[in-house]
């Protein structure tokens, strides 16, 4: 049986998942589908990672937490009455039918008001989600330094965000500028 | 062997500030999230906030939002909570935790905190 | 928040006894669920992960059980070591939350 978890078209969803690494370093490849677990693998995949990276993953779905520790928990962004249905979760541990599998439903609530887009959202598509994987994506996509300079009085929305995200790190680090005024 | 050593008891004056430092040995604090918990006398277990020492990312509980700070030296291998503004209501005992990733396998030993004129 | 509601608050049993403690979750939290023992003037220490995995080191008699938003913490032998107050804890998502506690005492 699965366990249900609630999201409202437009917000993020997030289906929790975690194991707990043998030893520092020592990660097990984790699988998100679409879909209840099959017997091996997990269908419709929306991301993977393998025993270093996140190895594969589709636009708006990324991991927030850090899978290095063992939080393989996946959101969902900007979520629509599509998004509904099962998640598989498989925490791929090596042996025989040793698979961790979680299957999560995901009920997508129409909106109570249906918001405008709002800027943080034309930010994230052209900048994808991506970057807010706590930097563990492949290496080429954490080469941010080709950035463009971000105006925060145009972009108002987006100012809580970045004041408690990876994005803000990322940014930093980057050495992309952030003007504020 | 897995252990957190937390500083010594503290007392201190009303509107003062205090940092509380939490050192592991027997493994690497950038390995693991790590916790502060707050315990009043004969009261239950209160969640601060957490560190990802790896890349200084914070978490906090909404009540303490503003008055926690966590932070972590990967170089020493302490994790650190300072405590501004102190009320008698910040008295209590504070642990520092390690979490493996959801679940806390490892405490130190408490560190009693009294606010005091 | 997640609210985790803890019952009973306080125990008074017998040893040799089975009890139970449960825990009620105000969403969903699957099964990332820990139990917490915390003796008189000591630290609180880990029991019991992912509903019912047993940490190490842990007796036999302490198990735990469900998944969802409800779940139970059963002490079957009772022993006069198992004296303590007894926590619920979710790690599913921020803040975290702990129940408030269940204060065992031996008849």
């Known amino acids: 049986s699965e366990v249900e978890y609630r999201a409202e078209v437009g917000q993020n969803a997030y289906l929790p998942c975690f194991y707990t690494p043998a030893a520092p370093g020592n990660l097990v490849p984790v699988c998100w589908g679409k879909g209840a677990c099959p017997v091996f693998e997990c269908g419709n995949v929306v991301l993977r990672t393998d025993e270093r990276d996140v190895n594969y993953w589709t636009s708006r779905y990324w991991l927030n937490g850090d899978f290095r520790k063992g939080d393989v928990s996946l959101t969902i962004e900007n979520v629509t009455l599509a998004d509904s249905g099962i998640y598989c979760c498989r925490i791929q541990i090596p042996g025989i039918m040793n698979d961790e599998k979680f299957n999560l439903k995901l009920v997508i609530k129409p909106a109570k008001v249906t918001p405008a887009p709002t800027r943080q959202r034309d930010f994230t598509a052209a900048f994808p989600r991506m970057l807010t994987t706590r930097g563990h994506g492949p290496a080429e996509t954490q080469t941010l330094g080709s950035l463009p300079d971000i105006n925060l009085t145009q972009i108002s929305t987006l100012a809580n965000e970045l004041r408690d995200s990876r994005l803000a790190n990322d940014l930093r680090d980057s050495g992309a500028t952030i003007r504020i005024g | 062997e897995v252990q957190l050593q937390q500083s010594g008891a503290e007392l201190v004056k009303p509107g003062a500030s205090v940092k509380l430092s939490c050192t592991a040995s027997?493994?690497?604090?950038?390995?693991?999230?790590m916790h502060w918990v707050k315990q009043r006398t004969e009261q239950g277990l209160e969640w601060i906030g957490r560190?990802?020492?790896?890349?200084?990312?914070?978490k906090y509980a909404p009540k303490f939002q503003g008055k926690a700070t966590i932070t972590a030296d990967t170089s020493s291998n302490t994790a650190s909570l300072q405590l501004s503004s102190l009320t008698s209501e910040d008295t209590a005992v504070y642990y520092c935790?390690?979490?493996?990733?959801?679940?806390?396998?490892?405490w130190g030993q408490g560190t009693p905190l009294t606010v005091s004129s | 928040d997640i609210q985790m509601n803890q019952s009973p608050s306080s125990l008074s049993a017998s040893l040799g006894d089975t009890i139970t403690i449960t825990c009620h979750a105000s969403q969903t939290i699957n099964v990332w669920l820990s139990w917490y023992q915390q003796k008189p003037g000591n630290i609180p220490k880990l029991l019991i992960y992912k509903a019912s995995k047993m940490h190490t080191g842990v007796p036999s008699r302490f198990s735990g059980s469900g998944s969802g938003t409800g779940f139970t913490l059963n002490i079957s032998s009772l022993q006069p070591e198992d004296i303590a107050t007894y926590y619920c804890?979710?790690?599913?998502?921020?803040?975290?939350?702990f129940g408030g506690g269940t204060k065992l005492e031996i008849k």
């Open positions: 804890h979710q790690g599913q998502s921020y803040p975290y939350t």
């Open positions: 935790a390690r979490s493996n990733p959801y679940f806390f396998d490892y």
């Open positions: 027997g493994f690497n604090i950038k390995d693991y999230y």
């Open positions: 560190i990802d020492p790896e890349d200084g990312e914070t």
